[in-house]
């Protein structure tokens, strides 16, 4: 069933997760600013195209519209997300020397998120019984292509999270 | 309640390597992240890496890069930390500490392994 | 990768006298979200670090209110306002901004 803004999670939670997603959008800011001054990839929408024959995932939070927000599927959501962009985050490793500091700070970072959401779900006695397994993550067959993976996935993460945050602020009204 | 709970002392000749095991329990194991951290001698806490062991990812920091490797059993709860060619600068003891976000991040740690490095 | 430098290395305090000890990073930690990813731990004799503070100013959990914490974006200071003989053992600094982690070289504090 449908539940409101009043439900049953705490405060604390909905501020650390608000904090946690304003982070990764600065490590997923970072990344996009170094893509496009090292190697001029400046525009996602550009390569929306090669994103599909790559096969790059959207993870979906349908579940979390303000209106009719069901708690326990938004949260089942929300990680799994989080879980599908480790996966993603983890298939550009070794995209380059100058970009690997701001992707491995940008990966444990989602998984964090993860972890936080995981615990909450688990107190409310949500959790899923077992990990969803990773699905078939992208293979990247040159440098070109995980780079401009990196510019795709830095943009759905981005996306992903605009819409996390305007959910979790929405939760966060009194 | 967490408990981290990690293998004996060591002693090792130079070249060798060792695989030092931190059990976890009291939690469910592979939903947070595992850190390794290094304490020479007299010395001060250095940061090894972590593994994610939902997606059996590791990352390092680049001094350790080449000669660790950090892996996790799910099925067991326990995390490892394998460091090879050792050399006497690697006597040192060894913690894991469990991951996370603001009041998460090493909350929680293991008791230390002491890893001696001796011809 | 982001330097801790901390001060002084040991610090020898009378039981019921205030402490203090400084830490400087390399790089500003605080994040545009408006936390700053400073942490304190604590290694008492013969035991595993501790989680003192966390983002720069907050009490973990069971740790005394004589402990508190405070800073800008790099120089950070942690007080504790009347010493205990609990209280001795080496205080770490550390950065959980960005990777790698860093840490303190630790200040050692002792009862005179």
């Known amino acids: 069933t449908p539940l409101g803004p009043a439900s049953s999670l705490p405060q604390s939670f909905l501020l650390k997760c608000l904090e946690q997603v304003r982070k990764i959008q600065g490590d997923g800011a970072a990344l996009q600013e170094k893509l496009c001054a090292t190697y001029k990839l400046c525009h996602p929408e550009e390569l929306v195209l090669l994103g599909h024959s790559l096969g790059i995932p959207w993870a979906p939070l349908s579940s979390c519209p303000s209106q009719a927000l069901q708690l326990a599927g938004c949260l089942s959501q929300l990680h799994s997300g989080l879980f599908l962009y480790q996966g993603l985050l983890q298939a550009l490793e070794g995209i380059s020397p100058e970009l690997g500091p701001t992707l491995d700070t940008l990966q444990l970072d989602v998984a964090d998120f993860a972890t936080t959401i995981w615990q909450q779900m688990e107190e409310l006695g949500m959790a899923p019984a077992l990990q969803p397994t990773q699905g078939a993550m992208p293979a990247f067959a040159s440098a070109f292509q995980r780079r401009a993976g990196g510019v795709l996935v830095a943009s759905h993460l981005q996306s992903f999270l605009e819409v996390s945050y305007r959910v979790l602020r929405h939760l966060a009204q009194p | 309640q967490v408990q981290l709970v990690q293998s004996g002392a060591e002693v090792k000749k130079p070249g060798a390597s060792v695989k030092v095991s931190c059990k976890a329990s009291?939690?469910?194991?592979?939903?947070?992240?595992m850190h390794w951290i290094k304490q020479a001698p007299g010395q001060g806490l250095e940061w090894i890496g972590y593994i994610n062991p939902s997606i059996g990812y590791a990352n390092y920091n680049q001094k350790f890069r080449d000669r660790a490797t950090l892996t996790a059993d799910k099925s067991t709860s326990t995390a490892y930390m394998e460091l090879s060619s050792l050399r006497s600068e690697d006597t040192a003891v060894y913690y894991c500490?469990?991951?996370?976000?603001?009041?998460?991040?090493?909350?929680?740690w293991g008791q230390g392994t002491l890893v001696t490095v001796s011809s | 990768d982001i330097v801790m430098t901390q001060s002084p290395l040991s610090l020898p305090v009378t039981p019921g006298e205030p402490a203090s000890i400084s830490c400087r990073s390399s790089?500003?930690?605080?994040?545009?979200?408006?936390?700053?990813?400073l942490y304190w731990y604590l290694q008492k004799p013969g035991q595993s670090p501790q989680l003192l503070i966390y983002?720069?100013?907050n009490l973990a959990s069971g740790v005394p209110d004589r402990f508190s914490s405070s800073g800008s974006g790099t120089d950070f200071t942690l007080k504790i306002s009347r010493v205990e003989a609990e209280d001795v053992g080496v205080y770490y600094c550390a950065q959980n901004l960005e990777l790698p982690y860093t840490f303190g070289q630790g200040t050692k504090l002792e009862i005179k």
């Open positions: 983002q720069m100013s």
């Open positions: 500490a469990r991951g996370g976000y603001g009041d998460s991040l090493f909350a929680y």
């Open positions: 009291g939690y469910t194991f592979p939903i947070y992240t």
């Open positions: 790089k500003s930690l605080l994040h545009s979200n408006g936390i700053t990813y």
